[in-house]
Interface confidence: low
């Protein structure tokens, strides 16, 4: 036949077929053409658009020995894992001379069991606390109807009464499982089963019951814990830092907290071995067989001042006539607060005790009554804080002053 006439005819002798299947299916579309002369490159179209990155292979078989003889060309387009984006009308396209030829169309359709775009996730929730679960599925075929199951028992959500995709659970009192069934004309797909673990609610009203310099007694109100009794509560105390960190809302303390466990009830705990006159932050969480609640917010507390734990050190008292000179050093033992001053008491053998508040000085000159003939004078010194006096020193006898 003359070339001119031949060019008018479609060179395609095989057109793409139809593929309809479920997601993930692997399939191949084929085009076959017979041409005279040099075989052309076969392009694939989807819905009229050239596929630039098509996974296609082209096989060319000459039907004669001469270059100008006919060739059979087979182009195969492989669809490795069928997705919604693969669906549409497929055609082959070739440029021959000054003409463009397009094959008859083949169709790729997705039709199978529903496919989950989103499935319910495992999570923990506080007892009796509302939460939402999500599930989303698509076909085709559409429509896809969702059915929620709680502990394998179906729940219903009315059309137009809250989206099927989101299940609002007003609260749970026991650990439960949730899954979602997606129904379409092809059948049913079941999602993963999400375990919703019911933890105790965060305790409330953490407060101080009593304070001592090295001890704080605290109490709190437990939250609901569903059907699971609380096994214990855990209290953490941490030394407050420079005002950043915890107070700025950081979730974790800057250093290792002091942790104590309380049997419950009662929901109360005595925290000992604390530093006096020191700011702390405390928090509490309660635990059931299902796990711990969330921690309460950090509560700032402070131990009160205590009295100094020891007397002033190195007291010396010397006498010179009707005057006595007494000096001492700060107690080595912990002050348990802010040192406000010292008290001094002196007494003769047959005279009443004289008590003096010296303030923060560490020395004092005493004016003794009369000619200073009072015998066996002794001096005692104590340090004090806002909480009161520390222990008195042992009596120190006044020694006569020796010059030089």
């Amino acid at each position: 036949a003359p070339r001119g006439t031949q060019a008018e005819e479609s060179p395609f002798v095989g057109n793409p077929g139809n593929i309809t299947g479920a997601r993930g299916l692997t399939g191949t579309l084929r085009c076959q053409l017979q041409v005279q002369g040099e075989p052309p490159e076969v392009h694939w179209l989807r819905d009229g658009q050239i596929l630039e990155l098509a996974d296609s292979t082209q096989t060319q078989v000459p039907l004669g020995e001469d270059e100008q003889d006919d060739w059979i060309v087979v182009s195969q387009l492989r669809i490795t894992s069928l997705q919604l984006s693969d669906t549409g009308q497929y055609q082959c396209l070739v440029f021959l001379g000054h003409q463009t030829f397009v094959s008859q169309p083949g169709y790729v359709g997705l039709e199978g069991l529903p496919y989950f775009l989103e499935e319910p996730e495992d999570r923990t929730v506080a007892a009796n606390t509302p939460f939402n679960l999500s599930c989303q599925a698509q076909g085709p075929p559409e429509p896809v109807d969702l059915l929620w199951l709680q502990d394998a028992v179906p729940l219903a959500t009315a059309p137009g009464h809250g989206p099927q995709r989101s299940l609002h659970v007003p609260g749970l009192n026991k650990t439960s499982s949730f899954s979602c069934e997606a129904h379409n004309a092809k059948g049913v797909t079941t999602s993963r089963t999400a375990t919703i673990t019911v933890l105790p609610q965060q305790p409330r009203n953490l407060h101080l019951v009593s304070r001592q310099p090295t001890e704080l007694e605290v109490a709190w109100t437990p939250g609901l814990s569903g059907i699971y009794p609380l096994t214990h509560c855990t209290l953490q105390a941490v030394l407050s830092d420079d005002g950043m960190g915890i107070q700025a809302g950081e979730p974790d303390p800057p250093e290792e907290p002091l942790t104590s466990q309380a049997s419950v009830p009662p929901h109360q705990l005595r925290l000992g071995s604390l530093h006096p006159h020191t700011p702390y932050h405390i928090r509490v969480a309660c635990t059931s067989s299902q796990g711990p609640s969330s921690w309460t917010h950090w509560l700032p507390v402070e131990t009160p001042e205590g009295v100094p734990l020891g007397p002033p050190e190195n007291i010396s008292a010397t006498r010179n006539g009707s005057q006595a000179f007494v000096h001492w050093q700060e107690p080595r033992a912990p002050l348990q607060g802010t040192l406000l001053g010292y008290r001094l008491a002196y007494q003769g053998q047959d005279t009443p005790e004289v008590l003096m508040d010296i303030g923060l000085r560490q020395e004092v000159t005493l004016e003794l009554q009369g000619d200073g003939s009072v015998s066996n004078l002794t001096v005692c010194v104590a340090a004090y804080t806002a909480a009161g006096d520390g222990p008195w020193s042992l009596p120190v006898p006044l020694e006569a002053w020796r010059p030089g």
Epitope: L155, A156, P159, H161, P170, V188
Partner: antibody
């Protein structure tokens, strides 16, 4: 037109077995969930069992679990209820019902019923 | 098990009246309530599902309403053919449960 016809009822002694059938027509049977519901002489309705369109999921009333089996043969458009270890309290009119598209736990079409009497 | 309680076993009405039949669920059934009508010697017929959705072919004088635990079926302009038993049912979860029924009769 949706049509459901039950058969297989009768009078049996306690402990006996009976199989009810329900032939469906007028709709694509495999697209719908189906249920059995019974009505006692005091006019009370009691749900007995349900089955999904494909037959893969079944649900039962607690006091029939282990004694009754709901099944379906989609190729024959037929629903079944196999009842064994029958008790006098199973005496009732048994209805076959189609589940509505919007919720197959709501029943949009019912058969005329098949009577089951369990008596010694 | 969700218990459906129809507090009135009988309700008297006159032709042309408006009557409401009530049903109370023992827990929230999120509007998954159906209403059925049954006449003597006949099988039940679905009137309403999802609390307020009228089934195909049901006259619009039948209206369902309610949410949470309280539901009602209202028949406005009662006709003689409406004299029957009415049952509520929860289609929220298994076991599916019905109310004991309310008989609508003429005064």
């Amino acid at each position: 037109e949706v049509n459901l016809v039950e058969s297989g009822g009768g009078v049996v002694k306690p402990g006996a077995s009976l199989k009810l059938s329900c032939e469906a027509s007028g709709f694509t049977f495999s697209n719908y969930g189906m249920s059995w519901v019974r009505q006692t002489s005091d006019k009370r309705l009691e749900w007995v069992a349900s089955i999904s369109g494909g037959g893969g999921r079944t649900y039962y009333l607690d006091n029939v679990k282990g004694r009754f089996i709901i099944s379906r043969e989609n190729a024959k458009n037929t629903l079944y209820l196999q009842m064994s270890s029958l008790k006098s309290e199973d005496t009732a009119l048994f209805y076959c019902a189609r589940g509505a598209r919007a919720s197959y736990f709501a029943m949009d079409y019912w058969g005329q019923g098949s009577s089951v009497t369990v008596s010694s | 098990v969700i218990v459906m309680t129809q507090s009135h076993k009988f309700m008297s009405t006159s032709v042309g009246d408006r009557v409401s039949i009530t049903c109370k669920a023992s827990q929230d059934v999120t509007t998954a309530v159906a209403w059925y009508q049954q006449k003597p010697g006949q099988s039940p017929k679905l009137l309403i599902y999802w609390a307020s959705t009228r089934h195909t072919g049901v006259p619009d004088r039948f209206t369902g309403s309610g949410s949470g635990t309280d539901y009602s079926l209202t028949i406005s302009n009662v006709q003689t053919e409406d004299l029957a038993f009415y049952y509520c049912q929860q289609h929220f979860t298994t076991p599916l449960t019905f109310g004991a029924g309310t008989k609508l009769e003429l005064k």
